[in-house]
Every structure is written in C-alpha cells, then in structure tokens.
C-alpha cells in the first residue's frame, strides 16, 4: 500500500553537533528499513547526507543528523524518502529551532550557613555561541510528598544554586534536576538532567 506521513517532521538542533527530526507515519512502519531522510546545507557545493531513521514508537520515526559548526544563517533542505517516493520536502534552520543539550553532573554539597550548594556543568564548550546564553531551571522535590516542590530560575551566568536548608523539611529526602534554555535563540527547554538525591537536615 501507499506510504504516508501523518505528522510531518519536527526538528531541533543542539546547535553544536546534532539535529534531531521526528515524524509520525499513518501506520506502523519499520523506519530504518523503509525510510531515509536526506539533508543538505542550502549552499552551492554542499554535500548531500542521508540519515537512517529509527523507531521511537510503532509509527513514530526519529533521525539524528550530525551537523557540524552550526552558524545562524544555515538552512538545510530536508527530503523524506520511501524508496524512490518523495514523501515530504521542507527546510530547517537550526538556529531557529534550538533545543539545548542537557546540563550535566548535577551535585549537591553542604555549604556554609546551613545552605546547600547545587552545582552542574554547562553542556557547551566556552567557544560555542550557547555557552554564555544559557539560563537554567532547577526543580527540587520532596521524594515522599509530591506537593512539596520548588522551582528556581537561575538567570545569572554560573551553573550554581544556593539553597537554604530551612526552606526544605528537615529529615526529608529531596531530589533535584536541572534543565537549560537559551533566551536569545528563543529555544525550547532542554531535557531534564538525571536527578540527584540528598537528605535535608538542619538544626
């Protein structure tokens, strides 16, 4: 039977090395066997690359495309193929569809004056455009009380948050996770980092 795209590709870029496109077919599809996504920088003399998609669900396909040294003006031409049949054609500008990398290495340390110091790593090297553009959201939640949670917006440069122990319940176990956003690129939020857990105590 004929192959059709139900939801056309939606793409995001981490703006350093990878862009990811996801789309939905109108019926369960073996993405890697049946489909190919070709992508090419819209620039005279640029190489045409092919991405082999993988299944995320029965009818949902995802393709991860290495895209090096992204710059703001870059536009990619995308073509989705099922054999010789062109299913969809479109363009994608990575700088207009940024989803930052996930912050890493979230740790919690006791600090002076009954505070906790939460630290994580900026996921971009210093030379990348996004390194100095990221702001963060930290979610702190009580492991045993779903209604006891706090959200902190970290809008200053350093990937740290100081948290007064007294703002949390003593003797309770808390988990924290962090995600990033690039305001000047009007990005989406990154995925949440893995959680880190600690026991809150103060006198």
């Amino acid at each position: 039977g004929s192959v059709k795209v139900l939801h056309e590709p939606s793409c995001f870029s981490d703006y350093i090395s990878t862009s990811v496109c996801q789309w939905k077919m109108d019926h369960p599809t073996n993405c890697s066997a049946e489909l190919r996504l070709s992508y090419q920088l819209d620039f005279m003399g640029s190489e045409n690359h092919t991405c082999v998609p993988e299944n995320r669900e029965d009818s949902v396909c995802v393709c991860s495309m290495p895209i090096d040294d992204a710059v703001e003006a870059d536009v990619y031409q995308l073509d989705l193929w099922a054999g010789q049949q062109l299913l969809w054609s479109g363009s994608f500008q990575p700088s207009k569809h940024v989803k930052p990398r996930t912050p890493g290495n979230l740790t919690v340390h006791p600090n002076i004056s009954h505070t906790w110091l939460l630290m994580w790593t900026n996921p971009y090297p210093t030379e990348n455009h996004l390194h100095s553009e990221l702001t963060y959201m930290v979610n702190v939640s009580n492991d045993n009380d779903p209604e006891d949670f706090k959200v902190y917006n970290v809008t200053y440069m350093g990937p740290t948050l100081r948290l007064a122990a007294s703002t949390l319940k003593s003797g309770a176990s808390y988990s924290a996770r962090v995600r990033a956003w690039a305001q000047t690129y009007n990005s989406t939020w990154s995925d949440w980092s893995p959680s880190t857990t600690w026991l809150n105590y103060y006198e």
């Epitope: 005279m44 003399g45 045409n48 690359h49």
Partner: antibody, heavy 117, light 107 residues
Framework: QVQLKESGPGLVAPSQSLSITCTVS????????VHWVRQPPGKGLEWLGM???????DYNSVFKSRLSISKDNSKSQVFLKMNSLQTDDTAMYYC???????????WGQGTSVTVSS | DIQMTQTTSSLSASLGDRVTISCRAS??????LNWYQQKPDGTVKLLIY???RLQSGVPSRFSGSGSGTDYCLTISNLEQEDIATYFC?????????FGSGTKLELK
C-alpha cells in the same frame, strides 16, 4: 582540532609522476570534501580538484587527463597523483577542507614540489 | 571558466587605515565569493565566505560586501598582523577560481 598536513617528495624529475598524501585529523573524511590547490612560485592559487565525502571526484579540466584524487577514510588520508610533470608544475601544493559550499576553511601548510632533472 | 580579477596587485597603507580590496568576476556569481589571507610563510586562512559572512575566529575589523560581479574586502582598522596577500575566490561553479591576489604592504 582540525588539521591537515601534506607530505610529498619535494623533487620530481620531468615526465615522472607526483604523489602527495594529505593526512587529516579533527574531522571525518566521510562527511567533508577535501580540495587540492597549488601555487607556483610568486603566482596565484590554482584549484586542481576535489574529493567529496561520498567519494566522488571533480577535477579542473586543465588537469583532468593527468590527475587522480582518492582517499582512505579509515586512515584519514587523501591522495593526489599527477602524471607527466613538467617544470611549470613546480609549486606549493595545498590540501584544504571544504566549509560552507566551496569555501575552504582549513588548509594544510603546503608541500613544496620542484620539477627538475 | 569564471575569471576572477583583482586589478590592484599591491597596496600600501598605514596602521589604523581603512583598506578596501576589490575583486571582479567575469559573470554573476550570486554572492558565492570568498576571501582568503595568505601570510608570507604561506599559511592560508579563510576570512569571509558568501560575500559577507565572517568566518569564526576572524576579527570583526574584516568585512565583505558586493553582489553580481563586483565584490570588496574591507579592513576597517589595519593592524600589523594584517600584512599579507589577499585572494578572492568564486564558489558559484566548478572549477573554483581565484583572483591573482592583492599584496598589502606598510607605508
């Protein structure tokens, strides 16, 4: 970081062939095309040809009959072979990586080739 | 083949000067024009691609402009390290072709 380095024989006798290797690091030859450009002493730059990431080649028609470009992705090496050299082939030979389209963003330091008996 | 012409083979300027180097193509190259700097030791560096896009790491005193067949490279505030030869290159069609170069010297 991205680097390209040419290695050649230095001296070639007239009518003999020239072989130069360009060894690259910091990027994959399967994703980037590599170009060869030469510069005779005191003169301008002259494009010889290129090999695409996919392995196909394009040559300057002036050299097409005696030029061959190949590569070994696993060894990160690109090879230039030019036959029937004459004295006016004396030049500095550069390999360079493609960037946006046909812009060449990283160049090797060049290898000097003298054609003389 | 597309011919690239740099009419000025050498140019003398003083530190701090604004310097403009021109390049003309034998036909419309649709802004596919790149500029390179070659130092006396032979090192070649991409400065500007697609007429006006500054290559990463290149100082902002370098800028490019033009359209159709006529293009320019401008150095707004000449520094000692800018003393070099500058080549234009068309990237519209193969074979790629370069201008003959403009050698920038200090007065």
């Amino acid at each position: 970081q991205v680097q390209l380095k040419e290695s050649g024989p230095g001296l070639v006798a007239p009518s003999q062939s020239l072989s130069i290797t360009c060894t690259v690091s910091g990027f994959s030859l399967s994703r980037y095309s590599v170009h060869w450009v030469r510069q005779p002493p005191g003169k301008g730059l002259e494009w010889l040809g290129m090999i695409w990431g996919g392995g196909s080649t394009d040559y300057n028609s002036v050299f097409k009959s005696r030029l061959s470009i190949s590569k070994d992705n696993s060894k990160s090496q690109v090879f230039l072979k030019m036959n029937s050299l004459q004295t006016d082939d004396t030049a500095m030979y550069y390999c360079a990586r493609t960037y946006r389209g046909y812009a060449l963003d990283y160049w090797g330091q060049g290898t000097s080739v003298t054609v003389s008996s | 083949d597309i011919q690239m012409t740099q009419t000025t083979s050498s140019l003398s300027a003083s530190l701090g000067d604004r310097v403009t180097i021109s390049c003309r193509a034998s036909q419309d190259i649709s802004n596919y024009l790149n500029w390179y700097q070659q130092k006396p030791d032979g090192t070649v560096k991409l400065l500007i691609y697609y007429t006006s896009r500054l290559q990463s790491g290149v100082p902002s005193r370098f800028s490019g402009s033009g359209s159709g067949t006529d293009y320019c490279l401008t150095i707004s505030n000449l520094e000692q390290e800018d003393i070099a030869t500058y080549f234009c290159q068309q990237a519209n069609t193969l074979p790629l072709t370069f201008g003959s170069g403009t050698k920038l010297e200090l007065k």
